[in-house]
């Protein structure tokens, strides 16, 4: 019989008492085969973290700073359940740490030196740890003691709870630095008042502070937020302009064998029976013998944290950077205005080899990081382990939902001004063998399908989106008799046609021979009835252009396109017979890397782009013998995006809507995790 006990860790007598009450009340409402609670008492949160890691306890609820400690080795804990605040309809699990300024003050984030600062309190998250952690490497050396470095960075401050004797500048704007509401500039509202009164130039608070203090929109319009990219935004655009997004209060468990499903089952049932306004005799979010015992008193309920989400992703790049800077106190030696090498994310070993060659040729400008799937690469870019990669539009959508931004677009047509003219896109097509003359768009049911990969534009999002509109369900593996759609569940019929050996079967990378445009076309040639690819795929792999044994004798005339009106046309008539226009592949990165990635890639394409004529004797960035490694092989240049610099603007309303409709069919664990952080 599996042990269905969750050992909750309590950090005080009062918590232990509440835990026992929780245990007893749960026993009274949950069947004997359901989850149960046991209580473990420890002296501190850090002791609880260690106990969970050592399998002496299973769960505890932590503030963000402690979630970071819990994640660090050797603890390796992960977030499993989040408390939410507000309403069930609009649950808030995060708050945003922001830098508020007056509208007419004219400086940016990188010009804070010499300004006057208002903080909620020394050592507090939004008011101190996050802003000072993010500014850490701009502070004058020596950076220890930290208070002295901060005092020397700003021209004056109010940092309640600081030592006014040792660091008088930190108390210059609020004499005495009182650590309670007796100090008019203490806490969130106090720090904002410090700005409002004109004592300070910037207030470090949370996003809701300004709304709680200024009910009138006209008053709020006198303030702006400083963004990390050295721009400003209105105060209601905090989701796009903040210092960090911080989880409020989170249940953590072991990463391996951590009982996360059981913990969720327990807490979900607990909130049903003892949540807000549910029961008089025991209330989960109430602490008669103290404050915030086990859970925050202000919580309204729990949400399950998506399983793909580790602590780094949950806390977010900015928060992790800030806390790591404060804890480790290390800064790069290079001057900050110089670009560090761009860490390119390469998929599996084929791309890694090409990336390594690029790295050798780039003279220190490019480094390489490997991952097994595109989603793993996106996650690495999010958390700073990697910086950039070029993505199909379907993954630009996921990357965008995860906070990444497009920086340059692949262009596929030769033109005089290639780098300045991003193209409208390419065509997604359905290809069949000419010999299968009865096959049309309207009778694909039961046929064998070949896809570039799940989640990609031409190979999945466009054809499956169109199909979904017709069949109104997501069971595409039942619609086709079998197929190869790399990235599908291994036991799916959409992995049956794939050719990868062993663990590589149906993997969404080049270890699967039927992956990508060329792979999907090969699948059609060798096994399938229809391939969903781009309009250039057939000509690029026929007429001797692909020397591989399977392709060298193929003839373009032996293939036709399926049109949406039920007719068929020759391959060259793609402009009048396609499924949809697809946005070109694009390079994505984190916002903080945007300028450097742009600069370095433009240099790199001038050295190794399509101006290089002899690719056998020189490194060519856009060539890999039809394998589309790192970039599509038909890339002519990487083009500036001009104002199409967000994923929505880049992909276009129509495509974003189409992918949004397919979201109900999405198997992307990363998309699920990212929409948890930003619904």
């Amino acid at each position: 019989v599996p042990d269905k006990t969750v050992r909750w860790c309590a950090v005080s007598e009062h918590e232990a008492t509440k835990c026992q009450s929780f245990r007893d009340h749960m026993k009274s409402v949950i069947p004997s085969d359901g989850p149960s609670v046991a209580c473990v008492k420890k002296a501190s949160y850090l002791d609880c973290i260690r106990a969970i890691a050592a399998n002496e306890a299973d769960a505890v609820t932590l503030d963000a700073g402690l979630v970071y400690d819990a994640y660090l080795a050797p603890n390796n804990l992960k977030p499993v359940v989040a408390e939410f605040y507000g309403s069930k309809e609009d649950p808030q699990t995060f708050y945003y740490a922001v830098a508020v300024v007056k509208k007419d003050s004219g400086f940016q984030m990188n010009q804070l030196r010499g300004k006057k600062s208002c903080h909620t309190g020394l050592g507090r998250s939004a008011g101190w740890n996050i802003p000072i952690g993010l500014l850490y490497c701009d502070l004058p050396e020596p950076r220890k003691p930290l208070e002295k470095a901060v005092a020397n960075f700003f021209s004056g401050s109010c940092a309640p709870c600081a030592d006014g004797t040792d660091f008088p500048q930190l108390c210059q704007l609020c004499p005495g630095c009182g650590c309670s509401t007796l100090n008019q500039y203490f806490g969130y509202s106090g720090a904002f008042k410090c700005l409002k009164d004109g004592a300070g130039d910037v207030a470090f608070v949370k996003h809701s502070t300004i709304f709680e203090n200024l009910a009138n929109k006209a008053d709020r319009d006198q303030y702006e937020l400083l963004c990390l990219d050295n721009t400003r935004k209105p105060v209601d655009e905090y989701k796009d302009c903040h210092l960090a997004q911080v989880p409020s209060h989170t249940v953590v468990a072991r990463s391996m064998g951590g009982k996360e499903d059981l913990i969720w089952e327990l807490l979900n049932q607990a909130q049903e029976h003892f949540g807000k306004d549910k029961s008089k005799e025991f209330q989960l979010f109430s602490s008669p013998h103290g404050k915030d015992l086990l859970f925050k008193d202000s919580a309204h309920g729990f949400l399950k944290v998506p399983p793909r989400m580790d602590a780094k992703m949950y806390l977010g790049y900015e928060y992790v950077t800030a806390i790591r800077n404060l804890r480790e106190g290390t800064c790069p030696e290079a001057p900050t205005d110089e670009c560090k090498p761009v860490k390119w994310c390469a998929l599996s070993h084929h791309e890694r080899l090409k990336c390594d060659e690029w790295s050798v040729n780039s003279v220190g400008k490019i480094e390489c990081v490997s991952a097994e799937t595109t989603e793993d690469c996106i996650a690495k870019i999010m958390n700073g382990e990697a910086d950039a990669m070029s993505l199909d539009g379907g993954f630009v959508y996921i990357a965008g939902k995860c906070g990444l931004v497009p920086v340059l677009a692949e262009n596929y047509n030769k033109s005089d001004n290639c780098e300045d003219t991003p193209e409208a896109g390419y065509f997604a097509i359905a290809v069949v063998k000419k010999s299968a003359s009865d096959l049309t768009w309207d009778n694909l049911k039961g046929k064998k399908s070949c896809h570039t990969a799940v989640g990609r534009t031409a190979g999945w999002n466009i054809p499956m989106g169109l199909l979904y509109n017709k069949i109104n369900h997501c069971r595409f593996d039942e619609f086709f008799s079998e197929g190869c759609a790399p990235g599908s569940k291994k036991d799916s019929s959409l992995c049956k046609l794939c050719m990868g050996s062993g663990l590589n079967l149906c993997e969404p990378n080049n270890k699967e021979g039927y992956y990508g445009y060329t792979g999907a076309f090969r699948c059609l040639v060798e096994k399938g009835d229809v391939a969903f690819v781009k309009h250039q795929t057939v000509p690029q792999n026929t007429g001797g252009k692909n020397p591989d044994p399977w392709a060298k004798n193929l003839n373009e005339k032996d293939y036709e396109l399926l049109c949406l009106d039920g007719t068929r046309k020759p391959v060259e008539e793609y402009a009048n017979c396609h499924l949809a226009r697809a946005p070109n592949h694009a390079v994505v990165t984190r916002k903080d890397k945007e300028a450097c990635v742009h600069k370095i890639l433009r240099q790199q394409q001038h050295l190794f782009g399509s101006n290089v004529t002899d690719c056998s004797g020189n490194f060519c960035l856009f060539r890999s013998e039809t394998k589309d490694l790192l970039f599509r092989d038909d890339t002519v240049c990487l083009a500036k995006l001009h104002d199409r610099n967000t994923y929505e603007k880049y992909l276009g309303e129509e495509y974003v809507k189409a992918v949004g409709n397919l979201r109900k069919c999405s198997t992307s664990s990363l998309l699920e995790a990212c929409t948890f952080r930003r619904p």
């Epitope: 084929h350 791309e351 080899l353 090409k354 390594d356 060659e357 050798v360 040729n361 003279v363 690719c615 056998s616 004797g617 020189n618 490194f619 890999s624 013998e625 394998k627 490694l629």
Partner: nanobody, 117 residues
Framework: QVQLVESGGGLVQPGGSLRLSCAAS????????MAWYRQAPGKQRELVAG???????KYADSVKGRFTISRDNAENTVYLQMNSLKPEDTAVYYC???????????WGQGTQVTVSS
């Protein structure tokens, strides 16, 4: 097709030196980039050092200052001079000509380097 044959490995004490050679059966003069990789048991194959046709080099952080890569286009050979060897340098060392290696798994047999006292 150019075949690559690695040699020069062996057993050496910590602090010792070895010089690996990679001989090509055809011309390497036109190959854009040549490189040495290594693979320790249970680990991924990793780039140790690379050299472009023009002589630009790159080294893994773990070998910087200890290893030197060079190429002799006339002799169709690439070398890896390894000094101040450490136990963690123990691995099979492979040489590759990038112009083919990422289209097909184009690797030689490699040469075993063991650093042990």
């Amino acid at each position: 097709q150019v075949q690559l044959v690695e040699s020069g490995g062996g057993l050496v004490q910590p602090g010792g030196s070895l010089r690996l050679s990679c001989a090509a059966s055809g011309s390497i003069g036109s190959s854009a980039t040549m490189a040495w990789y290594r693979q320790a048991p249970g680990k991924q194959r990793e780039l140790v050092a690379g050299i472009t046709r023009g002589g630009t080099t790159k080294y893994a952080d773990s070998v910087k200052g200890r290893f030197t890569i060079s190429r002799d286009n006339a002799e169709n050979t690439v070398y890896l001079q390894m000094n101040s060897l450490k136990p963690e340098d123990t691995a099979v060392y492979y040489c590759t000509d990038y112009s083919r290696s990422y289209y097909e798994d184009h690797w030689g047999q490699g040469t075993q380097v063991t650093v042990s006292s």
